[in-house]
Interface confidence: low
């Protein structure tokens, strides 16, 4: 009898243990991706970045996808998601087309119901990067709390892409779930 | 028969309740680290940061350990890091050596294992800080989702240390844990 | 007996998950707050922004208020709060009334026990906004981990509100619970 | 720079109105911090009295809410003191001074006026 | 309301030594508190805040301490021009509070 309740509560408390870390590890899916330099575009219109890194160096993801440039939403929930984005010249790069800049990037999300993409956040700034200085930098930081659908999907978009600075530590976005939705 | 079975049904809740209540607490550390201007260095060459305060105003610290100017990791996990960095001046502290200033912050990873440091994310601006005005701000906001070891360690490097605005709502890095490793 | 003792197992499952499930939502507020550009105040002057959507595209709240222009807390925790602000002028509005410009944030925190505000977060940059040039764009992004109790009031206060971006994706705060205070 | 400079008369006698004036150059009142008063007694002893913050809201020490009252002009960048009822433990020195964003320490300080209640 | 205690209502020292001034808080502050310096015939001037971080341009030989009731602020190689009456203040609560302060004076 009461070894018989014992062994119950044993696999009660197992079987909770082994629920609570599973559904732990199944709620928290996560991705930082860096950017992948090999195939930056180049130019000074805005584009969509297409080449990202997910499993080398700070690069990582699980229970999520990426593809074609995008970070798929594999669990419904609200996640926190996140970029930084690093722009740097330097003149030994050659002259600028124009030193009037405007240095941007717009997180998107991309809804399977609705083929459109909608930005869910941007920053940026206007720069006046003049011959006087040999070198400029400047980075943007943008992040925010969203709702987000299995299939839905996150992509970057920046202006003046041939300015991107390649570094893992520099140019990267990424996204970690919060909590499910109710 | 019934009524120890319903004592053994409370000692699971109640076990589960204290276990659920531990584990969730001692899953999450977190810091949040405000910058110690008493001790901050001079120049405008690059340095570590590593006086911060972790027990007044704003900054706390559970489950992980601030020594020698670095936040240590004692519990594995991926973590949220962020650092905001303040940059000032103004013209009652004197001329600046060189009105182009290069404002950066860098988030550094010491492994154990591997004793050099890594740079997780960086940030900052090129700036020309004309003596035509006669005050000058400028902040950085980086942010990152990150595997941590224990005993791992973070630290903060910036450039143009002297100009930091030494407010704890201005310079400040911290960070918190998401979740366990797989 | 056997049969008795899988009921109550079934019982302390069922319980648990209801339990888990019911904590699990409790314990996470959050807010994602987008600019209600219907009324931004006008000038050059810092402001407190009191009008903020929570229920219209990316604004969303749960277990938290907002309430005469600031996020109320209703559940003590450990928050992690953000804010993203862009100013922005295009020529077509008319000359500022200087080029000179300081575009600040601050994430302010009244307490009810200090009917005072106290600035928990800041970030911004001086500006030289020129006539030559026909647009300026300038983004700001703070983020950080702090200790709320129910009561406390989050707001943002801003410089030159006039210059600010409309669009949800570009002035927004917002906070989400990741612990409980010990 | 900030400056601040306190304005009023030096005598006033019992049971009328003290009114004293703050006068702030290098920033504007409505910018940014709280603006206090604060007094201080013949042996030093300082009271704090009360502030205005930039938005306009106002606190006040619960000891004399009932006889004082801070105000503004924004326009003349200047706040203000309304002090009713002043007996002869009002003689102090009057200071005005500016408080820190995130910290209600004071960073800026006027001279100070002082004032003696006297019949 | 939160009464800030100084003990000493004066202190003597020498140039050179290091002196310790003390404040007690009746109720725990945190670290909600700030010192002043006020020498004869001018207004007090901000010293530290947060209980232990210099205000901009105020000399290292400055240090403050404490937390919760009991603060300390400390003046090492003490100089004549450091004659004055430092006072402490609290600001966890309103109303704002400030210590009876301690003359120091220069043997």
């Known amino acids: 009898g009461s070894q018989h309740i014992r062994a119950e509560k044993a696999m009660v408390d197992g079987s909770w243990l082994d629920l609570a870390k599973r559904s732990k590890l199944e709620a928290q899916p996560f991705a930082h991706l860096t950017i992948n330099a090999t195939d930056i575009p180049s130019g000074s219109h805005k584009v969509s970045l297409s080449s990202w890194y997910h499993d080398r160096g700070w690069a990582k993801i699980s229970n999520m996808t990426f593809s074609n440039g995008k970070l798929i939403v594999n669990q419904d929930g609200f996640y926190y998601l996140y970029a930084n984005i690093c722009f740097r010249h330097h003149e030994t790069s050659g002259d600028l087309a124009t030193e009037y800049l405007q240095l941007m990037v717009y997180v998107t999300k991309t809804s399977i119901k609705i083929p459109s993409s909608h930005t869910l956040m941007k920053g940026g700034s206007t720069k006046y990067w003049s011959g006087n200085s040999e070198f400029h930098f400047y980075s943007i930081n943008v992040g925010g709390f969203f709702k987000l659908r299995s299939g839905e999907e996150i992509s970057i978009e920046v202006s003046n892409p041939s300015l991107l600075d390649p570094d893992q530590d520099a140019t990267y976005f990424g996204a970690f779930k919060v909590r499910d939705i109710d | 028969g019934s009524q120890h079975i319903r004592a053994e049904k409370a000692m699971v809740d109640g076990s589960w309740l204290d276990l659920a209540k531990r584990s969730k607490l001692e899953a999450q550390p977190f810091a949040h680290l405000t910058i110690n201007a008493t001790d901050i260095p001079s120049g405008s060459h690059k340095v570590s940061l590593s006086s911060w305060y972790h027990d007044r105003g704003w900054a706390k610290i559970s489950n992980m350990t601030f020594s020698n100017g670095k936040l240590i990791v004692n519990q594995d996990g991926f973590y949220y890091l962020y650092a905001n960095i303040c940059f000032r001046h103004h013209e009652t502290s004197g001329d600046l050596a060189t009105e182009y200033l290069q404002l950066m912050v860098y988030v550094t990873k010491t492994s154990i294992k591997i004793p050099s440091s890594h740079t997780l994310m960086k940030g900052g601006s090129t700036k020309y800080w004309s003596g035509n005005s006669e005050f000058h701000f400028y902040s950085i906001n980086v942010g990152g989702f990150f595997k941590l070891r224990s005993g791992e360690e973070i630290s903060i490097e910036v450039s143009n240390p002297s100009l930091l605005d030494p407010d704890q709502d201005a310079t400040y890095f911290g960070a918190f844990k998401v979740r366990d490793i797989d | 007996g056997s049969q008795h003792i899988r009921a109550e197992k079934a019982m302390v499952d069922g319980s648990w998950l209801d339990l888990a499930k019911r904590s699990k939502l409790e314990a996470q507020p959050f807010a994602h707050l987008t600019i209600n550009a219907t009324d931004i105040p006008s000038g050059s002057h810092k402001v407190s922004l009191s009008s903020w959507y929570h229920d219209r595209g990316w604004a969303k709240i749960s277990n938290m208020t907002f309430s005469n222009g600031k996020l109320i807390v209703n559940q003590d925790g450990f928050y992690y709060l953000y804010a993203n602000i862009c100013f922005r002028h295009h020529e077509t509005s008319g000359d500022l009334a200087t080029e000179y410009l300081q575009l600040m944030v601050y994430v302010t925190k009244t307490s009810i026990k200090i009917p005072s505000s106290h600035t928990l977060m800041k970030g911004g940059s001086t500006k030289y906004w020129s006539g030559n040039s026909e647009f300026h764009f300038y983004s700001i992004n703070v983020g950080g981990f702090f200790k709320l109790r129910s009561g406390e009031e989050i707001s943002i206060e801003v410089s030159n509100p006039s210059l600010l971006d409309p669009d949800q994706d570009a002035t927004y705060f917002g906070a989400f619970k990741v612990r409980d205070i010990d | 720079d900030v400056q601040l400079q306190e304005s009023g008369p030096d005598l006033v006698k019992p049971s009328q109105s003290l009114s004293l004036t703050c006068t702030v150059t290098?920033?504007?009142?409505?910018?940014?911090?709280?603006w206090h008063w604060i007094r201080q007694f013949p042996g030093n002893k300082l009271e704090w009295m009360d502030y205005?913050?930039?938005?306009?809201?106002?606190n006040y020490n619960p000891s004399l809410k009932s006889r004082i009252s801070i105000t503004r002009d924004t326009s003349k960048n200047q706040f203000f003191l309304q002090f009713i009822s002043v007996t002869t433990e009002d003689t102090a020195t009057y200071y005005c001074a500016r408080s820190g964003p995130s910290t209600y320490v004071m960073d800026y300080w006027g001279q100070g006026t002082s004032v003696t209640v006297s019949s | 309301d939160i009464v800030m205690t100084q003990s000493h209502r004066f202190m003597s020292t020498s140039v050179g030594d290091r002196v310790s001034i003390t404040c007690k808080a009746s109720q725990d502050v945190g670290a909600a508190v700030g010192w002043y310096q006020q020498k004869p015939g001018q207004s007090p001037k901000l010293l530290i805040y947060w209980a232990s971080i210099r205000d901009t341009g105020v000399p290292d030989r400055f240090t403050g301490s404490g937390s919760g009731t009991d603060f300390t602020l400390t003046i090492s190689n003490v100089q004549s021009e450091d004659l004055a009456d430092y006072f402490c203040?609290?600001?966890?609560?309103?109303?704002?509070?400030f210590g009876g302060g301690t003359k120091l004076e220069i043997k």
């Open positions: 290098g920033y504007s009142i409505s910018s940014g911090y709280s």
């Open positions: 205005i913050h930039f938005s306009g809201s106002t």
């Open positions: 203040q609290h600001y966890n609560s309103y109303p704002l509070t």
